[in-house]
Amino acid sequence: RKIPKVGHTFFQKPESCPPVPGGSMKLDIGIINENQRVSMSRNIESRSTSPWNYTVTWDPNRYPSEVVQAQCRNLGCINAQGKEDISMNSVPIQQETLVVRRKHQGCSVSFQLEKVLVTVGCTCVTPVIHHVQ
Amino acid sequence: GITIPRNPGCPNSEDKNFPRTVMVNLNIHNRNTNTNPKRSSDYYNRSTSPWNLHRNEDPERYPSVIWEAKCRHLGCINADGNVDYHMNSVPIQQEILVLRREPPHCPNSFRLEKILVSVGCTCVTPIVHHVA
């Protein structure tokens, strides 16, 4: 999947664009908003009716090297009595993000953009029920 | 930057950390994943904390279209199909990396940008405090 070129409907390519070899693009990995602190709701993963745990995956050939994945704790959802109700389903909610992958071929190094699917949390859903003949 | 194990036979000049600027292949590796969450599942409608999906489009960004979730209700849907306001629909937020055209409008020059997106909603049981 290629990154779309800038459409002329939006704007003309400025003269100031850096020269880039064919088939590749220049990527600055100094992240914009790197230090912005987000005030996430505290411990929603524990208070949710479809609670989840977090696992940190680590890969030194990936940037960022740390990616956090959520896993639903239960198959069902937690009811008002604090018990698991298996007539409902805890399901993962997923979001794509981009990472930079470093590849070693002998002593040369190349870089590749990669889409990674991250599970960010869980939600409680009413299952669609089919009765099989 | 992050440290990388190096092949012992390679020249010592290679940097252990990711360089600040890299040249990357224009093809993005991985799964022609469906970026429209409306097509990938109907959880947004079947959840006890349902949400609407809003299209956020920016031609200076890749991906140019990002879907933002907004919880439909303050409370959660109970077994009778009514909103229970003793529970909360809460957005699940996630920081993701996108590409920002830099300098602006350039077709093949980008910078990574971290943005916060609401991906969906979850139903939460709040701890209740009575204020004196």
Epitope: S39, S41, R42, N43, I44, R47 | K70, C71, L74, N88, V90, V124, P126, I127, V128, H129, H130, V131
Partner: nanobody
């Protein structure tokens, strides 16, 4: 610690208006929504109206839709409930509620009496 100060309750006649206010102070950051519940004598506490902090989305109980209006002032952490065309069945103790997603704070309540 969070403090909630409610004001504006009182006695009115049917058809009259009243405006309730609630001010939050202390560690009232990361607000999810702000709103009002009420409890009539011998009845369960019920939701009246709420306003989401992030985008000012509002929600109302069917019984008050079209008569009550909730509004907020972000800079002051206050929420107001404008109650018009009041009815005897609106008589109740009105509780201000500040919701921080995983924690919810209830005020002490202010009495609204509607009778002729």
């Amino acid at each position: 610690e969070v403090q909630l100060v409610e004001s504006g309750g009182g006695s009115v006649q049917p058809g009259d208006s009243l405006r309730l206010s609630c001010a939050a102070s202390g560690r009232a950051n990361s607000i999810n929504w702000f709103g009002w519940f009420r409890q009539a004598p011998g009845k369960e506490r019920e939701f009246v109206a709420g306003i989401r902090w992030s985008d000012a989305y509002t929600e109302y109980a069917n019984s008050v839709k079209g008569r009550f209006t909730i509004s907020r002032d972000n800079s002051k952490n206050t929420v107001d409930l404008q109650m018009d065309s009041l009815r005897p069945e609106d008589t109740a103790v009105y509780y201000c509620v500040l919701d921080l997603s995983t924690v919810r704070y209830w005020g002490q309540g202010t009495l609204v009496t509607v009778s002729s």
